[in-house]
């Protein structure tokens, strides 16, 4: 019989593959039907009978055309720092992704195995590189003329306001305070006008090293606890 009208199971011509959605069974030496996604092979084919497929049980799945004897188990329920972005069905595994404010520190084929909170840059430091689904925030010291007075995983260093007359000079963690009520350049919305204690650390005269981009969760590392990277806070 020509290949396209042969019914499974059939012996392929020498040098020919099986057709669409078929597999070659080494034992039967025949081309046999695969099972569709959501099913598995309950009974393998023989020379005279085709594969018998059955639906996957609850909490198990097959995503591909297959001839596996058992469906795969869906992954465990998502943890509290994750959201379920794809439910476990007969055709797909559960997918857990990190909730907002967290990033994936240890990914798996689909979704995330381990989430970690995004690093927060402390006052005097701003976000150099924002966090993504799979990477932590990178903090950098605020350059001369800029400041950040927040502990945040999103705030960048903002320019000091420019005063006609300076009451308190700005530093890396505090905006300049003007004596005049009308600075020449208004600051960014939401900026704090109240004077804050000036840091004793020499913010601008000494270059501060770029903080480590290591995850803020020390439990990921095969070593004892270590202090958080400079410019970041663990909470």
């Amino acid at each position: 019989l020509p290949a396209q009208v042969a019914f499974t199971p059939y012996a392929p011509e020498p040098g020919s593959t099986c057709r669409l959605r078929e597999y070659y069974d080494q034992t039967a030496q025949m081309c046999c039907s695969k099972c569709s996604p959501g099913q598995h092979a309950k009974v393998f084919c023989t020379k005279t009978s085709d594969t018998v497929c059955d639906s996957c049980e609850d909490s198990t799945y097959t995503q591909l055309w297959n001839w596996v004897p058992e469906c795969l188990s869906c992954g465990s329920r998502c943890s509290s720092d994750q959201v379920e972005t794809q439910a476990c069905t007969r055709e797909q595994n559960r997918i857990c992704t990190c909730r907002p404010g967290w990033y994936c520190a240890l990914s798996k084929q689909e979704g995330c195995r381990l989430c970690a909170p995004l690093r927060k840059c402390r006052p005097g430091f701003g976000v150099a590189r924002p966090g993504t689904e799979t990477s932590d925030v990178v903090c950098k010291p605020c350059a001369p003329g800029t400041f950040s007075n927040t502990t945040s995983s999103t705030d960048i260093c903002r320019p000091h306001q420019i005063c006609n007359v300076v009451a308190i000079p700005g530093n890396a963690s505090m905006d300049a305070v003007c004596t005049s009520t009308s600075p020449t350049r208004s600051m960014a919305p939401g900026a704090v006008h109240l004077p804050q204690p000036v840091s004793t650390r020499s913010q601008h005269t000494q270059p501060t090293p770029e903080p480590s981009t290591a995850p803020s969760t020390s439990f990921l590392l095969p070593m004892g606890p270590s202090p958080p990277a400079e410019g970041s806070t663990g909470d």
Epitope: A3, S16, T17, R19, L20, L64
Partner: antibody, heavy 119, light 107 residues
Framework: QVQLVQSGAEVKKPGASVKLSCKAS????????INWVRQAPGQGLEWIGW????????QFNENFKGKATMTVDESTSTAYMEVRSLRSDDTAVYYC????????????WGQGTTVTVSS | DIQMTPSTSSLSASVGDRVTITCRAS??????LNWYQQKPGKAVKLLIY???KLHSGVPSRFSGSGSGTDFTLTISSLQPEDFATYYC?????????FGGGTKLELK
């Protein structure tokens, strides 16, 4: 990234043969079928067949049995197709494409090789 | 062999338009319908497989629908880079066959 790079254009006389190549990179060559598809000038696409690189077994469109031969060189991740007894109506762009045998689609295509058959 | 026939060989549209391209199979092909985009001098690109599954990296403005014998490719808001020729292809039975193609042109 996953890509298929095909050999350059060919001009052949009627009755001659031509051997086209398709070099794969960016994935495990032996785990996907390589299909060949042709497109005559101003025409649609026509599937010629596929080869499974793991064992070299093939599946042909009946219209091309005896006309085309597909082979692979696993060591260089290259697929070849030889077309024999060329006629003017074999003038076409020949594409190689990576295929999925469950859904019958072609997810990665080569840039195509133009074969001109002219006396 | 299964014949695949596009409803039209060419179609004119403007940027921002919602465009539908249809394709009919000569017999039932279940959901085994794939769509491709071809631009001159460029490699052919898979857009949609198994009637409605979006291939990785394809913009979400492309979608597919239909079943049995009648299928539709929809572009929700046409972009300048979408002017090309579109092919349907059945993956139900061998030999695999393509439709004649629909050329999408600027109005």
């Amino acid at each position: 990234q996953v890509q298929l790079v095909q050999s350059g254009a060919e001009v052949k006389k009627p009755g001659a043969s031509v051997k086209l190549s398709c070099k794969a990179s960016g994935y495990t060559f032996i785990t996907y079928d390589i299909n060949w598809v042709r497109q005559a000038p101003g025409q649609g696409l026509e599937w010629i067949g596929w080869i499974y690189p793991r064992d070299g077994n093939t599946q042909f469109n009946e219209n091309f049995k005896g006309k085309a031969t597909m082979t692979v060189d696993e060591s260089t991740s290259t697929a070849y197709m030889e077309v024999r007894s060329l006629r003017s109506d074999d003038t076409a762009v020949y594409y190689c494409a990576r295929g999925d045998r469950d859904y019958g689609y072609f997810d990665v295509w080569g840039q195509g090789t133009t074969v001109t058959v002219s006396s | 062999d299964i014949q695949m026939t596009p409803s039209t060989s060419s179609l004119s549209a403007s940027v921002g338009d919602r465009v539908t391209i249809t394709c009919r199979a000569s017999q039932d092909i279940s959901n085994y319908l794939n769509w491709y985009q071809q631009k001159p001098g460029k490699a052919v690109k898979l857009l949609i497989y198994f009637k409605s599954k979006l291939h990785s990296g394809v913009p979400s403005r492309f979608s597919g629908s239909g079943s049995g014998t009648d299928f539709t490719l929809t572009i929700s808001s046409l972009q300048p880079e979408d002017f090309a020729t579109y092919y349907c292809q059945q993956g139900n039975t061998l030999p695999l066959t393509f439709g004649g193609g629909t050329k999408l042109e600027l109005k």
